[in-house]
Amino acid sequence: GSMGPVIRQGPVNQTVAVDGTFVLSCVATGSPVPTILWRKDGVLVSTQDSRIKQLENGVLQIRYAKLGDTGRYTCIASTPSGEATWSAYIEVQ
């Protein structure tokens, strides 16, 4: 059967250096395995940007951090029976 998702480990607030690489982690359980999406300030994060890599284990990696990457990032874990969210604020300086 279907079971609503639970985020076991979500992203954490962090301050990162401009041009560096930082990661956002979202580990979720549920049935079926939850789909993970990321939003930044409410807008879907696109992995079409070559700086942004969707790694395994629910990790979103952002290379060459820019000041414009500052914002609130939200992990959305979804299954057919619901969704769970977890947010963190990233400041690039």
Epitope: A17, D19, G20, T21, F22, V23, S25, S50, R51, K53, Q54, L55, E56, N57, V59, Q61, R63, Y64
Partner: antibody, heavy 120, light 107 residues
């Protein structure tokens, strides 16, 4: 193929510009890195640059002293090093960032290296 | 910064044996680990990426494993050609730090 050049002996405080000539692949589509191997055989990433040269990264140990750039028309990668210190003495390698799935950072082609000695 | 601790610093084994090299990270790196092999007088070569994925041209005698903070590289049925120094690298967040290396010799 990646071929580095420009290494040598330089005094502390001096400058050096390394070059890396690429061939055999479409240079302009790959991010590139510079890695050095110190005399005690440790490896250290000193610069990365994205495919169009618009983004670079340097660790704190070289930030403000090293600058990486590239000329995609000539298939050449550069590392300008200034205010050199004795601890910059190393073998410097240029390397190509692999295009992998999943997209982990990894370097799949390396040059033969060029030696830099900073000594008075 | 994430620190990478490799062990042992060196080891000696006989042809045909299986050896294991370990790499510990100072924090969870979520499988974002790369292994390189550097033979004497040569440039490093990519061996394993994403902790477990074998590079295209490498022998299946090499295998990577681990998660969280602890990782290992196993070399089975040791060949004389495996004599080299092996390095792990954190590739989760910058600086992408390397381990100090493990020098493998044949008895």
């Amino acid at each position: 193929q990646l071929v580095e050049s420009g290494g040598g002996v330089v005094q502390p405080g001096g400058s050096l510009k390394l070059s890396c000539a690429a061939s055999g692949f479409t240079f302009s589509t790959y991010d590139m890195s510079w890695v050095r191997q110190t005399p005690d055989k440790r490896l250290e990433l000193v610069a990365t640059i994205n495919s169009n040269g618009g983004s670079t990264y340097y660790p704190d140990s070289v930030k403000g002293r090293f600058t990486s750039s590239r000329d995609n028309a000539k298939n050449i990668l550069y590392l300008q090093m200034s205010s050199l210190k004795s601890e910059d003495t190393a073998m410097y390698y240029c390397a190509r960032e692999a295009l992998l799935r999943p997209p982990y950072y990894a370097l799949d082609y390396w040059g033969q290296g060029t030696s830099v000695t900073v000594s008075s | 910064d994430i620190q990478m601790t490799q062990s042992p610093a060196s080891l000696s084994a006989s042809v045909g044996e299986t050896v294991t090299i370990t790499c510990g990270a100072s924090e969870n790196i979520a499988g974002a680990l790369t292994w390189y092999q550097r033979k004497q007088g040569k440039s490093p070569q990519l061996l394993i990426y994403g902790a477990i994925n074998l590079a295209d041209d490498k022998s299946s005698r090499f295998s990577g494993s681990g998660s969280g903070r602890q990782y290992s590289l196993k070399i089975s049925s040791l060949h004389p050609d495996d004599v080299a120094t092996y390095y792990c690298q954190n590739v989760l967040s910058t600086p992408f730090t390397f381990g100090s290396g493990t020098k493998l010799e044949i008895k």
